[in-house]
Interface confidence: medium
């Protein structure tokens, strides 16, 4: 249990201490206090480095002192012969004696008291980022105007987060721009546009001045853009090092500006605007896009018309065109639809003739009808050659879709008549 | 056929055999047979055969039998109470529409019809082929196909021949421009049982083809001159009749 003061005496004090003892005392004062330990009497066998008998003062892992010999006060007004001041609230005192004593030594008498420590000055690491205020038993941190104390109760920062930008165009700057930005701050800005618009950020090189990177290339102060799973940055240095136009391909962008305790510069200023999400012109062979544009964006509608001889097969119905809309995700609707070659199907058979099995029945394929020669011939002309036309019919140059007609060859005997001489 | 030679059906693949009455006809396309009106006037449902050289019953069983759907006799053919006494054979032409189309091949294929141009006007001396299973010098009916090559003759040559078994006065027999006279050479002629068969002449515009210039009709006496229906004069009637009585598929 912590106490505010106490006394420590060597064994048998003020009589001679026994041989071969080791005794330790754990001193603890309340949190927020240091310990003032002082000896009023010291009579311990002297040896080099106090190797034989000694009293040891330990603070954590550090030996604050090791005492032996005989001491008397330097100050006639004070009984103190040795003292220690530690800024911690715990201390250990260990007394050791060896197996023999040449003479009779009386040991030591020591007292400790809890003393206030000045956390603001007594430590190498300053506990507060801005103002440190000491009081008996502790300290507190405080901040300059317009700064607030973070949850760690030590660091001050500016309140620069929480802004959500929804307008299709806007400007965002670091706090105090173009005056130096606050140290030790994390500023988060959110841009949230309507779906179908991508955030495009534009910066001018001269509108960016952020503490430069360290020798390892790590930004000490940094500006980062996060769009979904894509990150742009971190950026730092004099003059913007990134692309002057950042197309995020997203309608949501988080801007994170992180600063450390030192090296404030003028900061940055950027503009953003919402671009309708572009849709790439996709591979759609054998078709024409109407209207034809160099770039298509969100809500654009195109009519994709198949070339003659191609059709869009949706279910069982064949159409020659379809509509596609550039969607908010940058993808086209109906993107699975394709212009496929018209299939004229298996050609009809004809009487007294035949058609060779076509290699293919798709658009452009050619078939040939023939009549059963020499007994039939093609009466209605056209040569018997048909091609699979754009309308899905087998078509002949002369007859159109009409099939050839094989009619009997007349007047031709297979063998000529020869009169027998009688 | 009098004075003719043995023939093979492949020489005359258009030749059609009628078994009642015993006669001939000419196939002109898949659905139509051309014959003489006097062949079908007494039997409007004739049985016909194609593709066989021999008309022996056993051979006919293996040949292609044709079933008639309808018989069209030329409207100018005069129907008589007693056909045996006929002296007027003008317009002796008829068409038989078949129920099913005939499949053509080496032994069955049609004969062409004459064109309407003057190229198809016959001159005396033009040669034509006749064929049939009619009376020969030796027998009343031939079992195997016979044929002969005859020249066209002036109509007066037919008029000059005395009718063998007249059923009326010689002057009663009618001769018209619708008739072709042919024969008179080496006794080659058509005869009873050859009626309706084609008088086939080489096409003047395509020497590989024959057309039906005439149809065996009648004659004063077998082995002299014979009379044949002049088909060229009936081409319009033939075409019109076939068109009006065809299925849409044939059109």
């Amino acid at each position: 249990e912590p106490t505010m003061y106490g006394e420590i005496l060597s064994p048998n004090y003020p009589q001679a201490y026994p041989s071969e003892v080791e005794k330790s005392w754990d001193i603890e004062v309340p949190e927020g206090y240091g310990i003032h330990l002082y000896f009023t009497h010291l009579d311990i066998e002297l040896s080099e480095n106090c190797a034989y008998d000694s009293v040891q003062i330990i603070s954590g892992d550090t030996e604050e002192g090791r005492l032996c010999g005989q001491r008397s006060s330097n100050n006639p007004h004070s009984p103190i012969v040795e003292e220690f001041q530690v800024p911690y609230n715990k201390l250990q005192v260990i007394f050791k004696s060896d197996f023999s004593n040449e003479e009779r030594f009386t040991g030591f008498a020591a007292y400790y008291v809890a003393t206030d420590i000045n956390e603001c000055t007594d430590f190498v690491d300053v506990p507060c980022s801005h103002f440190c205020n000491n009081f008996i038993g502790g300290y507190f941190c405080s901040c300059p105007p317009e700064y607030f104390l973070h949850d760690d109760m030590k660091n001050c920062g500016v309140n620069c987060s929480g802004d959500v930008f929804t307008a299709l165009i806007g400007e965002i700057a670091s706090p105090n721009y173009p005056k130096p930005y606050p140290e030790n701050s994390r500023c988060e800005y959110q841009i949230r546009l309507e779906k179908g618009f991508q955030v495009v950020v534009t910066l001018r090189r001269e509108d960016f001045d952020v503490e430069a990177a360290d020798s390892a290339g790590n930004c000490l102060d940094s500006l980062v853009f996060v769009a979904g799973d894509r990150q742009f940055g971190p950026y730092c240095g004099h003059g913007f090092p990134g692309p002057l136009n950042i197309e995020t391909k997203s309608n949501a962008l988080d801007i994170i500006f992180q600063t450390d305790l030192t090296g404030q510069k003028k900061g940055w200023k950027l503009r953003y605007h919402g671009d309708p999400m572009p849709c790439p012109k996709e591979d759609t062979p054998n078709s024409v896009w109407e209207p034809a544009k160099a770039k298509y964006v969100f809500r654009d509608v195109v009519q994709i018309t198949c070339l003659d001889g191609f059709e869009v097969v949706e279910g069982r119905v064949g159409a020659t065109s379809f509509y596609s809309t550039c969607q908010s995700n940058g993808k086209w609707s109906n993107s699975k639809l394709k212009c496929q070659p018209v299939d004229c199907g298996i050609p009809e058979s004809i009487e007294n003739g035949k058609v060779e099995d076509p290699e293919s029945t798709l658009f452009g394929s050619v078939i040939r009808y023939t009549c059963e020669e020499p007994y039939y011939y093609m009466e209605n002309g056209g040569g018997g050659e048909y091609h699979c036309a754009g309308n899905g019919s087998w078509v002949n140059e002369v007859l159109g879709p009409e099939l050839p007609k094989c009619v009997p060859v007349c007047g031709v005997p297979r063998e000529p008549f020869e009169e027998k001489q009688r | 056929i009098i004075g003719g030679s043995d023939a093979d059906i492949k020489n005359f693949p258009w030749q059609v055999f009628f078994d009642n009455p015993w006669a001939g006809g000419a196939l002109i396309n898949e659905y139509w047979v051309l014959t003489a009106a006097h062949v079908v006037e007494g039997n409007r449902e004739p049985t016909m055969y194609v593709g066989s050289t021999s008309v022996q019953t056993s051979r006919l069983a293996k040949s292609k039998m044709l079933t008639p759907e309808h018989v069209f006799i030329h409207p100018g053919w005069k129907l008589l109470e007693v056909p045996e006494g006929r002296t007027n054979f003008d317009n002796d032409i008829a068409l038989v529409r078949l129920k099913d189309p005939v499949k053509m091949g080496p032994t069955v294929s049609p004969i062409c019809l004459p064109g309407t141009s003057s190229d198809y006007n016959l001159m005396d001396g033009d040669l034509g082929l006749i064929s049939g299973w009619g009376r020969t010098e030796k027998r009343d009916r031939a079992v195997r196909l016979k044929a002969a090559r005859l020249p066209v003759a002036p109509l007066r040559k037919c008029k000059e021949v005395k009718v063998e078994k007249p059923t009326a006065d010689a002057e009663a027999y009618v001769f018209t421009p619708n008739m072709i006279c042919a024969g008179g050479e080496k006794g080659m002629d058509s005869c009873k049982g050859d009626s309706g068969g084609a008088f086939a002449v080489q096409d003047p515009n395509d020497k590989t083809k024959f057309y039906a210039a005439g149809l065996v009709s009648w004659g004063p006496q077998c082995g002299t001159y014979g009379l044949y229906t002049r088909v060229k004069n009936y081409v319009d009637w033939i075409m019109k009749t076939m068109q009006e009585n065809s299925t849409p598929r044939e059109d």
């Epitope: 591979d283 062979p285 054998n286 024409v288 001889g309 290699e359 798709l362 050619v366 140059e397 | -």
Partner: antibody, heavy 118, light 109 residues
Framework: EVMLVESGGGLVKPGGSLRLSCAAS????????MSWVRQAPGKGLEWVAT????????YYLDSVKGRFTISRDNSKDTLYLQMNSLRAEDTALYYC???????????WGQGTLVTVSS | QIVLTQSPATLSLSPGERATLSCTAS???????LHWYQQKPGKAPKLWIY???NLASGVPSRFSGSGSGTDYTLTISSLQPEDFATYYC??????????FGQGTKLEIK
């Protein structure tokens, strides 16, 4: 960038076989019909075979029908030409080509040389 | 099959002159399926004009194409040194076979 790279050419005896491959990249291979075109030394272009985008339809030049087979593996973005019973007259530089609008051959490989000689 | 005949077989002209290359089909071809290619020695052919009149990517505007039915033309308004090459016409309207013309060699006079 669209790229077509042919391989598999070489010297073969008459009657022998070869299999040409065409590796495609830079585009959606399964969207396109593909062709093989050949060019005999010092001669013009001669179409050999075509295959539809899905691979179900094939077309051949009469003189190679029954000897050559065009095929494709859309999972590997590769076009093939299996050539059997090769003849001296099949000696040529063989190109693979992508068919685009109107079946124009908008991208060609660099070609692979097939030499048929005893 | 559709036979494509190109004329002339060789055309000798000087830079700056106008060049007209002809391609005649043995039967009618849809204009959507008639194309032209340029080939230089030792190189693969390049699509030059597609669907009769559309210039392929990167083709200079001095080139143009026209025609319908059986008669098609490739025209170069003012020849530049890099235009000298062999040009082939090609049809994919009636197939098989898909056919090419025999080529027109455009050479410097």
């Amino acid at each position: 960038e669209v790229m077509l790279v042919e391989s598999g050419g070489g010297l073969v005896k008459p009657g022998g076989s070869l299999r040409l491959s065409c590796a495609a990249s830079g585009f959606t291979f399964s969207n396109y019909a593909m062709s093989w075109v050949r060019q005999a030394p010092g001669k013009g272009l001669e179409w050999v075979a075509t295959i539809s985008s899905g691979g179900s339809h094939t077309y051949y030049l009469d003189s190679v029908k029954g000897r050559f087979t065009i095929s494709r593996d859309n999972s590997k973005d590769t076009l093939y030409l299996q050539m059997n019973s090769l003849r001296a007259e099949d000696t040529a530089l063989y190109y693979c080509a992508r068919l685009f609008t109107g079946y124009a051959m908008d991208y060609w490989g660099q070609g692979t040389l097939v030499t048929v000689s005893s | 099959q559709i036979v494509l005949t190109q004329s002339p077989a060789t055309l000798s002209l000087s830079p700056g002159e106008r060049a007209t290359l002809s391609c005649t089909a043995s039967s009618s071809v849809s204009s959507s399926y008639l194309h032209w290619y340029q080939q230089k020695p030792g190189k693969a052919p390049k699509l030059w004009i597609y669907s009769t009149s559309n210039l392929a990517s990167g083709v200079p505007s001095r080139f143009s194409g026209s025609g319908s039915g059986t008669d098609y033309t490739l025209t170069i308004s003012s020849l530049q040194p890099e235009d000298f090459a062999t040009y082939y016409c090609h049809q994919y309207y009636r197939h098989p076979p898909i056919t090419f013309g025999q080529g027109t060699k455009l050479e410097i006079k």
